[in-house]
């Protein structure tokens, strides 16, 4: 039975050109994490394999950095980065757990509503 739960950073609103950290945490299970995939829509961004370490997809190499931990840092954000990101935890013996984070990237001028843009 899958007893685990995924906690995420929560949805994030960020400014174009900035950087953000996407993080998920798997809790309430003793299952072993064998691999974590980070995806956006149908695109694979990065893989963190327990044995082989990190692999960043070539098309994202310039703007995606591994970590902290099993998280992912997105840099030089563009409006086109707006969308839903998935952290997919492959575990044994439980199977797959998925977390979801929505990232909204706004033009600098959209401080019109006073949204707080923070760059870690």
């Amino acid at each position: 039975m899958m007893t685990g739960t995924i906690e995420t950073t929560g949805n994030i609103s960020a400014e174009k050109g900035g950087s953000i950290i996407l993080q998920c945490h798997l809790s309430s299970t003793t299952a072993q994490v064998t691999q974590v995939n980070w995806e956006q829509q149908d695109q694979l961004l990065a893989i963190c394999n327990a044995d082989l370490g990190w692999h960043i997809s070539p098309s994202f190499k310039d703007r995606v950095a591994p970590g902290p931990g099993l998280g992912l840092t997105l840099q030089s954000l563009t409006v086109n980065d707006t969308g839903e990101y998935f952290c997919i935890y492959h575990t044994y013996p439980d199977g797959t757990y998925t977390g979801r984070i929505f990232l909204e990237v706004l033009e600098s001028s959209v401080a019109e509503h006073g949204a707080r843009f923070q760059i870690p």
Epitope: G10, N11, S13, E104, A115
Partner: antibody, heavy 119, light 112 residues
Amino acid sequence: EVQLQQSGPELVKPGASVKISCKASGYSFTGYTMNWVKQSHGKNLEWIGLIIPYNGGTSYNQKFKDKATLTIDKSSSTAYMELLSLTSEDSAVYYCARGFRGYFAVDYWGQGTSVTVSS
Amino acid sequence: DVVVTQTPLSLPVSFGDQVSISCRSSQSLTNSYGDTYLSWYLHKPGQSPQLLIYGISNRFSGVPDRFSGSGSGTNFTLKISTIKPEDLGVYYCLQGTHQPWTFGGGTKLEIK
């Protein structure tokens, strides 16, 4: 003035599909997400999902993943929601609502489209 | 999914009353950057819902200052300082911090 004009009421048979439209005006259509919300029994509100006109990306409430398909037509500033394999449980009022940038909320709503599923 | 619980379900009022509506979530609505995405809406009979408050406490354009929002973490409150006839309807809170977004069950403000 921001306006979201939805298509008219629909009476459909169980098992059929229906496509609701939401025509946006008074703002830059590609600059804001478009959300869809279901209201059943006159009270409960449920977020179905959203579409990003800028890049075509979508985010669905998993409950509606196999029920609703969100699309857009940029040229006419119109968002669409197709509801599939309809049952009586899908009888409700459906709203489109513009995303409120920076706050994960919605600011302007369409007038709603009533969908009745009945044989 | 995050469960959002609104209380009370129904709120009988008299014009001029001050009222509070509570919204509680099953997990914190503050993201890792310290932002909290909790908004409030009023759905009047025969109309579409309208945005009142966003980001816990910010009044949307044109919303009277008798409406105020407060709270943090998992507990949030909408206060209406002096009830007027146009305030009657169903109030909803919405959390947008976690996917999927979820609404509270609604609070019906009605005349005693």
